[in-house]
């Protein structure tokens, strides 16, 4: 007879897996809120700021009640990759005014990266279809002025904040259905 079979592969508990993803998302949400408040204190902004290169808010993609886990995770991963790219761009090209948001902006980037890895892991553990590799995104043009960089920062942090709220709501709602 051949060698004894190895220990059975423990299938992950999807609720526990989702839980740790929600925890990271909530933690990043709190960081983003704090950084957005810091930005508002230093550079008050009137009204909503938009940046055409940012993803459309996921919440407009449909009511939360109709969401399915693969759709939420795929959409969230795509949106967060875009936000990661924008945060990197902001740190590189945002100008001297935004240097006052370091090291917090660097910490945010690292935590965003960690959440993206966590999502990737969750998708593979739950045997969800892996999204195709992302096509190379066109480079982001540098802000036209110092104020342009500040407006971009308001748009990026505001959009990320709302996206993370959508993610927490969606993931916790899906958890109740598992």
């Amino acid at each position: 007879p051949g060698p004894p079979p190895g220990p059975p592969r423990v299938s992950p508990d999807p609720r526990a897996e989702l839980d740790s993803t929600v925890l990271l998302t909530r933690s990043l949400l709190a960081d983003t809120r704090q950084l957005a408040a810091q930005l508002r204190d230093k550079f008050p902004a009137d009204g909503d700021h938009n940046l055409d290169s940012l993803p459309t808010l996921a919440m407009s993609a449909g009511a939360l009640g109709a969401l399915q886990l693969p759709g939420v995770l795929t959409r969230l991963r795509a949106d967060l990759l875009s936000y990661l790219r924008h945060v990197q761009w902001l740190r590189r090209a945002g100008g001297s005014s935004l240097k006052t948001l370091e090291p917090e902006l660097g910490t945010l980037q690292a935590r965003l990266d960690r959440l993206l890895r966590r999502l990737q892991l969750l998708m593979s553990r739950l045997a969800l279809p892996q999204p195709p590799p992302d096509p190379p995104a066109p480079p982001l043009a540098p802000p036209s002025s110092a104020w342009g960089g500040i407006r971009a920062a308001h748009a990026i942090l505001g959009g990320l904040h709302l996206t993370l709220d959508w993610a927490v709501r969606g993931l916790l709602l899906l958890k109740t259905r598992l």
Epitope: D19, S20, L23, T25, R26, S27, L29, A30, R33, D48, L57, A58, M59, S60, A61, G62, A63, L64, G65, A66, H161, L162, L164, D165, W166, V168, R169, L172, L173, K175, T176
Partner: antibody, heavy 119, light 111 residues
Framework: EVQLVQSGAEVKKPGASVKISCKAS????????MDWVKQAPGQRLEWIGD????????IYNQKFTGRATLTVDKSASTAYMELSSLRSEDTAVYYC????????????WGQGTTVTVSS | DIVLTQSPASLALSPGERATLSCRAS??????????IHWYQQKPGQAPRLLIY???NLESGVPARFSGSGSGTDFTLTISSLEEEDFATYYC?????????FGQGTKLEIK
Amino acid sequence: EVQLVQSGAEVKKPGASVKISCKASGYTFTDYNMDWVKQAPGQRLEWIGDINPHGGGPIYNQKFTGRATLTVDKSASTAYMELSSLRSEDTAVYYCARGELGHWYFDVWGQGTTVTVSS
Amino acid sequence: DIVLTQSPASLALSPGERATLSCRASKSVSTSGYSYIHWYQQKPGQAPRLLIYLASNLESGVPARFSGSGSGTDFTLTISSLEEEDFATYYCQHSRDLPPTFGQGTKLEIK
């Protein structure tokens, strides 16, 4: 001053519907979720659901799914809760409350709207 | 759903005394340094008022005599020295999962 002002008391017959409004002022309406909480006499507070004013639809406590409908009018900074197929157990004070994104704690509350269901 | 049980149901104390209110959850509401428990005060005919969020953070404008502690399933709201205006009903609430739920309340009365 941050404020949530709710519509007045309502008396309804069983089977009817009620729609309560909650007008927000003193803060950016879209920066927070709007939650709704029920307080029936002698019962514990009950979370009904919440809505993000940016859109994407509300989420509900399963107990209220199908009977509660949460909506917002962003331009008027006003949230609404409609409760249909009313029964006597729906007699309660209903509160709107400002909810911290992603954390569900409520730092500003409306004054409450009393709904009485009686034939 | 997570069930929160508060004790005692009522408590009679005098101004100046220390009040300790307890809230126990049917399962852990803490994860990696976060405890998703919040405390509210409610007076008759009024809406609840947030006192403490995420177990131990004092809400802006709330007097420093209020403090929150605990983790896992057991949480405490402490009022270090009672003032006349503190006599009210206190509720704990969790937001660990959906739906958020509330405890049944502890009524703090003047002795």
